[in-house]
Amino acid sequence: QNASRGRRQRRMHPNVSQGCQGGCATCSDYNGCLSCKPRLFFALERIGMKQIGVCLSSCPSGYYGTRYPDINKCTKCKADCDTCFNKNFCTKCKSGFYLHLGKCLDNCPEGLEANNHTMECVSIVHCEVSEWNPWSPCTKKGKTCGFKRGTETRVREIIQHPSAKGNLCPPTNETRKCTVQRKKCQKGERGKKGRERKRKKPNKGESKEAIPDSKSLESSKEIPEQRENKQQQKKRKVQDKQKSVSVSTVH
């Protein structure tokens, strides 16, 4: 209806383009823009009971642009979609929906999980840890000498933190019993801590503080690697007992 009025208006005004606002190529006093300059989108804006044409450099949120030889127009995205490239390719879903491959879903497909921050369906990410670093020197109360039963530890880093549905991380540090090297402490060594004496320089960007404590990870799901570790630890305990027997005579 408005468009036909606009056409009548055009017949009454031969110079419809004169005095057009902004990006309008042709316009009328009553209907506003009738057509737009290149690379601009034509959209209808409701003002009270009246719809007027406007020319926009991009379509408003919730609309997408479609090109035709004579006009570029804005069309509404699907009802569940906030921003889109077209009706079939949503780029941001309305609240309560998850985006997956351009579609808005109530629930994510199997094998994917909902990211409630980005409101997307994302791949499940499992924990990844590095190889174990070498065992630390064997120490007892910080000393690396004195024929005592001590402990040694080793650590590994978390390379990839798991997502909500991913496998939790296995422990990132391990401690085992050991025998401090067979030599008497020298005077100067007595108070020196093995950690200070033999500490390797940490790699660039690596800090000891950043290594999570295994205690916080003890409750994690047991994964095959952990089972393996437990078996290894049992073996080690047996070996350690044998060691301690052979060492116990030297006191």
């Epitope: 690379r39 989108f41 450099s57 991009s58 997408y64 642009g65 479609t66 090109r67 035709y68 570029n72 069309t75 921003t83 490239f85 077209n86 009706k87 079939n88 390719f89 780029t91 941001k92 491959l101 351009g102």
Partner: antibody, heavy 117, light 111 residues
Framework: QVQLVQSGAEVKKPGASVKVSCKAS????????FHWVRQAPGQGLEWIGY????????GYNQKFKNRVTMTRDTSTSTAYMELSRLRSEDTAVYYC??????????WGQGTTLTVSS | DIVLTQSPASLAVSLGQRATISCKAS??????????MNWYQQKPGQPPKLLIY???NLESGIPARFSGSGSGTDFTLNIHPVEEEDAATYYC?????????FGAGTKLELK
């Protein structure tokens, strides 16, 4: 007129990251989405993803999702594409392009990335 | 993903003759009466250049000897009459679904 000027050629080692820039001029930077497309030597075109310069929202081809990050700087009308954990298969020419009503109508000149040990 | 299969992979055409390139989509790229299929031309060392948008609409500044047709899953690019400067690789591209995809390309050579 619309112009997209990309950063120069890059040579990287496997495992490294690269950040390619695309500076736009001749139009309002926030009006159109920016897309990135790559082309391996003698191969076809492959879409990587997009960014809305107006709000920074981005979306990526699933194939690149865990390795690519797209950002923009509205003050300099520049879009960026960072690709991490590079492998030899990432050797390609990387193009930025403006997306106007479901087609790529303006393209950058391309940035050649070589990944080699 | 929507797979676009272009044929032939290459073709040689004499000056002034017609070149026809086909692009078949693994599923429809139409929605709400619009076909989300575009055609690009690429010459060595240059970025692609938009020729046809929405299956059949000629991009401004592109000569009228280029034309596009088709809907649903079958699309065609025609060049008639072929001129020397048309020697290039031509790609179809769909914008209907995520991820956006391209055909493998058709290389046009002049006889």
């Amino acid at each position: 007129q619309v112009q997209l000027v990309q950063s120069g050629a890059e040579v990287k080692k496997p495992g490294a990251s690269v950040k390619v820039s695309c500076k736009a001029s001749g139009y309002t930077f926030t009006s159109y989405t920016f897309h990135w497309v790559r082309q391996a030597p003698g191969q076809g075109l492959e879409w990587i993803g997009y960014i809305y310069p107006s709000n920074g929202d981005s979306g990526y081809n699933q194939k690149f999702k865990n390795r690519v990050t797209m950002t923009r700087d509205t003050s300099t009308s520049t879009a960026y594409m960072e690709l991490s954990r590079l492998r030899s298969e990432d050797t390609a020419v990387y193009y930025c392009a403006t997306y106007f009503a479901n087609n790529f109508d303006y393209w950058g000149q391309g940035t050649t990335l070589t990944v080699s040990s | 993903d929507i797979v676009l299969t272009q044929s032939p992979a290459s073709l040689a055409v004499s000056l002034g003759q017609r070149a026809t390139i086909s692009c078949k989509a693994s599923q429809s790229v139409d929605y709400d009466g619009d076909s989300y299929m575009n055609w690009y031309q690429q010459k060595p060392g240059q970025p692609p250049k938009l020729l046809i948008y929405a299956a059949s609409n000629l991009e401004s500044g592109i000569p009228a000897r280029f034309s596009g047709s088709g809907s649903g899953t079958d699309f065609t690019l025609n060049i008639h009459p072929v001129e020397e400067e048309d020697a290039a690789t031509y790609y179809c591209q769909q914008s209907n679904e995520d991820p956006l995809t391209f055909g493998a390309g058709t290389k046009l050579e002049l006889k």
